[in-house]
Amino acid sequence: LVPHLGDREKRDSVCPQGKYIHPQNNSICCTKCHKGTYLYNDCPGPGQDTDCRECESGSFTASENHLRHCLSCSKCRKEMGQVEISSCTVDRDTVCGCRKNQYRHYWSENLFQCFNCSLCLNGTVHLSCQEKQNTVCTCHAGFFLRENECVSCSNCKKSLECTKLCLPQIENVKGTEDSGTT
């Protein structure tokens, strides 16, 4: 099975690597522009140079290309707690990340928010916090895990999942209540 190619990929595949087909003359292969530059004018003929210009401030191209415009630099989303790890250069987009002791929660493919790593109070660290995953906690006896925090079994209601984990405590509470009424 041949993978489906778009028109641009079809045109490029006729030329050797690092070159592309002249849009007005399919017998000419022009050299692609280096990263950090963009296509200003196609090469006038075979063996002649493509006119490539450097990206202006605030834009970039990260790979060889024949784009008519550079791509706009991404901005880190402060409202999502993101910080700039490295600023945009002509050949590399801005790199955004989170502060120390934070992890990324991806809302969608290109959108993440920074959250503080759980400290596992009233529990122990089962798996350390990672770039894209919160700490995994194991709770001490008398506590259960709710939204990755160890909560006292005294906050466990019968309808919740915690009843299995807190069963001995619940039974003890019932026992003391019963003995108090006799």
């Epitope: 929660h105 809302w107 969608s108 493919e109 290109n110 959108l111 928010q113 939204e147 990755n148």
Partner: nanobody
Framework: EVQLLESGGGLVQPGGSLRLSCAAS????????MGWVRQAPGKGLEWVSF????????YYADSVKGRFTISRDNSKNTLYLQMNSLRAEDTAVYYC?????????????WGQGTLVTVSS
């Protein structure tokens, strides 16, 4: 077919409260993060709040932090937005939206919207 149906909008006085609901159908609700987006008259779209499927992660715009609370009931396929201490600047059409897992757009489906008017 994905459907998102908002309700609960209306006219409220400054300082008042409203609770918006969004009934979702046509997809597995428990698999997707959901959100509320609003558009004030003559303004662009503003992200208001997001919530992930287990209700562990939430996002609030600075303009609504401490006043609005997002929640969801996965057993009822319903998303909520509790809005307290409403201000005139909260006047907008509020849209319930399904967050896209892939691609460059944050949302892939929207409801028709419900109008919230804050006025004395």
């Amino acid at each position: 077919e994905v459907q998102l149906l908002e309700s609960g909008g209306g006219l409220v006085q400054p300082g008042g409260s409203l609770r918006l609901s969004c009934a979702a159908s046509g997809f597995t609700f428990t698999r997707y993060s959901m959100g509320w987006v609003r558009q004030a008259p003559g303004k662009g779209l503003e992200w208001v709040s997001f919530i992930d499927p287990p209700s562990v992660h939430t996002y609030y715009a600075d303009s609504v932090k401490g006043r609005f609370t997002i929640s969801r009931d996965n057993s009822k396929n319903t998303l909520y937005l509790q809005m307290n201490s409403l201000r005139a600047e909260d006047t907008a059409v509020y849209y319930c939206a399904k967050i896209s897992q892939f691609g460059s757009n944050a949302f892939d489906y929207w409801g028709q919207g419900t109008l919230v008017t804050v006025s004395s």
